[in-house]
């Protein structure tokens, strides 16, 4: 569910929305670490229906889906984490 | 004027089919998601299916998913609920929903409801 | 499934009373959660979205908050409008469930 890339590319967020999305709505989240080139954190929400949705980092309702997955990874099954290393 | 009128329901032995519509008006209907909720006689409200816009998504209560067929026409602006092999337990007013994606997908509009009724 | 348990079950109150009534998730549901209010032979109207929104045209005496696992739903001046019975609901994941409703009587 959680992926973390580490890309060279610029910013891929134009626009952030801080509305909460629904567990069930989730195929899977995308978090970009500041720099790079963009010095902002982003986080992509990949949608089951395929919309992607910016998510501002900020939001309250993000930050707690990440902290629940990350407990419930370190606690059951790994969560998927992809890396790319900068180049 | 947002409009969500429920019909089909009406008085059905145990073991038979009725098939609920939801007629959708004042609304883009093919934008939304849409649930059924249900609501046996003097109890609570219960959850029973809901199917995205291009109805590749559905969800079902686990106790009704095999008997229970949710659907929708878009042309028509219309969502259906296919019950089969009804039991006592089924009787309960109907109700369909609008979800609202602009609100994290709560249920803003409700129809009036049908009632269903299985008994011998 | 996630369990939503809904107190007090019946609350019996006068005008201008604050009312408070909680709900708890059997697990974590972020901020997925919604109040109604039902009137009887009426659907339910939405009240609260995401734990905290109220819906548009919403009275503000009416407000939620919460997240995680515990909510609380309150009418800060309870009106004689504001009899009926009032659910939550959790929408974070499936299979969506109801608490069991709070049948809310003027004193």
């Known amino acids: 569910v959680l992926e973390v890339y580490y890309t060279s590319l610029r910013c891929r967020c134009v626009q952030e929305s801080s509305v909460f999305i629904p567990r069930r709505f989730i195929d899977r989240i995308q978090i970009l670490p500041r720099g790079n080139g963009c010095p902002r954190k982003e986080i992509i929400v990949w949608k089951k229906n395929k919309s992607i949705v910016c998510v501002d980092p900020q939001a309250e309702w993000i930050q707690r889906m990440m902290e629940v997955l990350r407990k419930r990874s370190s606690s059951t099954l790994p969560v998927p984490v992809f890396k790319r290393k900068i180049p | 004027e947002v409009q969500l009128v429920e019909s089909g329901g009406g008085l059905v032995q145990p073991g038979g089919s009725l098939r609920l519509s939801c007629a959708a008006s004042g609304i883009d209907f093919s934008r939304y998601w849409m649930s059924w909720v249900r609501q046996a006689p003097g109890k609570g409200l219960e959850w029973v299916a809901e199917i995205n816009p291009e109805s590749t998504l559905i969800n079902y209560a686990p106790s009704l998913k095999d008997r229970f067929t949710i659907s929708r026409d878009n042309a028509k602006n219309s969502l259906y609920l296919q019950m089969n092999s009804l039991r006592a337990e089924d009787t309960a007013v109907y109700y369909c929903?609008?979800?609202?994606?602009?609100?994290?997908?709560?249920?803003?509009?409700w129809g009036q409801g049908t009632t269903v009724t299985v008994s011998s | 499934d996630i369990q939503m348990t809904q107190s007090p079950s019946s609350l019996s109150a006068s005008v201008g009373d604050r009312v408070t009534i909680t709900c708890k998730a059997s697990?974590?549901?972020?901020?997925?959660v919604s109040w109604f209010q039902q009137k009887p032979g009426k659907a339910p109207k939405l009240l609260i979205y995401?734990?905290?929104y109220r819906y548009t045209g919403v009275p503000s005496r009416f407000s939620g908050s919460g997240s995680g696992t515990d909510f609380t739903f309150t009418i800060s001046s309870l009106q004689p409008e504001d009899i009926a019975t009032y659910y939550c609901?959790?929408?974070?994941?499936?299979?969506?469930?109801f608490g069991g409703g709070t049948k809310l009587e003027i004193k």
């Open positions: 929903a609008r979800q609202d994606d602009y609100r994290n997908y709560a249920m803003d509009y």
């Open positions: 995401s734990a905290s």
């Open positions: 609901q959790q929408y974070y994941s499936t299979p969506l469930t």
């Open positions: 697990q974590d549901v972020n901020t997925g």
